[in-house]
């Protein structure tokens, strides 16, 4: 899986989208988890409604919400009031039994507000780009990690 980068601004909200094949994942609940270390487990943050037919209902855990468009095949995660500690590697998952398929690996980057430090909380709706050149920091965007890029900074 390539890793897609979503950039958001601290104190604002970020929407992460994870497209998937709606037929292949028909009837499956979805989840959003946080990767603990480069090879560590993925810790569940929030999952969609227990009843698959009600997956469109937003479910919250703290300030993170998940909602699933099961017909269109798009899982949407909202990180409301983004904070620096939200930065890191995450996964969108499709659940079946005790197993989980990875739909998308996501690197969330949190930027300082370049516009107005008094103004907390702008909603940015990320578009997606596949190259680093398109990753303009004045917008909340997403891109795929280039080959060789490391999602976790080296630790000493």
């Amino acid at each position: 899986h390539n890793t897609t980068v979503f950039q958001g601004v601290a104190g604002q909200s970020l929407q992460v989208s994870c497209p998937y094949d709606s037929m292949k994942h028909w009837g499956r609940r979805k989840a959003w988890c946080r990767q603990l270390g480069e090879k560590g487990p993925c810790q569940r943050v929030v999952s969609t409604h227990n009843l698959w037919l009600l997956s469109f209902l937003r479910r919250w855990n703290g300030s993170t919400a998940i909602t699933d468009d099961t017909l269109g095949g798009t899982l949407t995660i909202t990180l409301r009031n983004l904070q620096p500690h939200d930065a890191g590697l995450y996964q969108c998952q499709s659940l079946h039994g005790s197993e989980a398929d990875t739909l998308r690996k996501v690197l969330v980057e949190v930027l300082a507000d370049p516009l107005d430090h008094r103004d907390a909380g702008d909603l940015w709706f990320p578009g997606e780009s596949e190259s680093f050149e398109d990753a303009h920091v004045e917008h909340s965007i997403s891109r795929s990690l280039l080959e060789g890029e490391i999602p976790f900074p080296p630790t000493s």
């Epitope: 604002q12 469109f56 209902l57 937003r58 479910r59 919250w60 855990n61 703290g62 300030s63 909602t67 468009d69 949407t76 909202t78 409301r80 009031n81 516009l115 107005d116 103004d119 907390a120 909380g121 702008d122 909603l123 940015w124 709706f125």
Partner: antibody, heavy 124, light 107 residues
Framework: QVQLQQWGAGLLKPSETLSLTCAVY??????YYWSWIRQPPGKGLEWI?????????NYNPSLKSRVTISVDTSKNQFSLKLSSVTAADTAVYYC??????????????????WDQGTMVTVFS | EKVMTQSPATLSVSPGERATLSCRAS??????LAWYQQKPGQAPRLLIY???TRATGIPARFSGSGSGTEFTLTISSLQSEDFAVYYC?????????FGQGTKVEIK
């Protein structure tokens, strides 16, 4: 059909604490943020703050030092406390749901359901 | 916070005529803007969200447009029940903020 109904004291003296509770009937309580909004007589609307079922809150900075919003998920209720009230806090207080759901475009954080409001008067 | 400014404060219009209400944001709110209608003694009612999408049950004579900092609510042919106060509100950031309102009255 989602309905909101609130109650609380309508007459207060300066320095007392305003206390209101809003009950949510029908729909999914856990899918939304729930807000308090007020309107002084003959004036415009002012957002006070919001909470979700997890207890996550956001407050208006102009009132933050005096406001506490709490939630009771077992009863599908959320409450507002505003301390040290003055005559300037005289207003109609509304509770509202934040999060209009559009089947095509998902959730929009507009206030789509309101209660009828409670008039709170602060008098000396 | 983002300041929302509505104009005019009062709009006098005859029934059947078109009414155009304006709302300006101090900074961009993208399309995260709603319009509400409020009649005396009642709670506000959501008319428009996402700057241009009508809420369920809102008549087609109400339309919204704009993005960024400039927004417009248009009532194509005013009916007697449309005379009220209209508020714009941004939900792009915290705190949520409303305009001061435009009163649409009978001319």
């Amino acid at each position: 059909q989602v309905q909101l109904q609130q109650w609380g004291a309508g007459l207060l003296k300066p320095s007392e604490t305003l206390s209101l509770t809003c009950a949510v009937y029908g729909g999914s309580f856990s899918s939304y943020y729930w807000s308090w909004i007020r309107q002084p007589p003959g004036k415009g609307l002012e957002w006070i703050g919001e909470i979700n079922h997890s207890g996550n809150t956001n407050y208006n900075p102009s009132l933050k030092s005096r406001v506490t919003i709490s939630v009771d998920t077992s009863k599908n209720q959320f409450s507002l406390k505003l301390s040290s009230v003055t005559a300037a806090d005289t207003a109609v207080y509304y509770c509202a749901r934040e999060g209009y759901y559009d089947i095509l475009t998902g959730y929009h954080d507009a206030f789509d359901i309101w209660d009828q409001g409670t008039m709170v008067t602060v008098f000396s | 916070e983002k300041v929302m400014t509505q104009s005019p404060a009062t709009l006098s219009v005859s029934p059947g005529e078109r009414a155009t209400l304006s709302c300006r944001a101090s900074q961009s709110v993208n399309n995260n803007l709603a319009w509400y209608q409020q009649k005396p003694g009642q709670a506000p009612r959501l008319l428009i969200y996402g700057a241009s999408t009508r809420a369920t049950g809102i008549p087609a004579r109400f339309s919204g447009s704009g993005s960024g900092t400039e927004f417009t609510l248009t009532i194509s042919s005013l009916q007697s029940e449309d005379f009220a106060v209209y508020y714009c509100q941004q939900y792009n950031n915290w705190p949520r903020t409303f305009g001061q309102g435009t009163k649409v009255e009978i001319k």
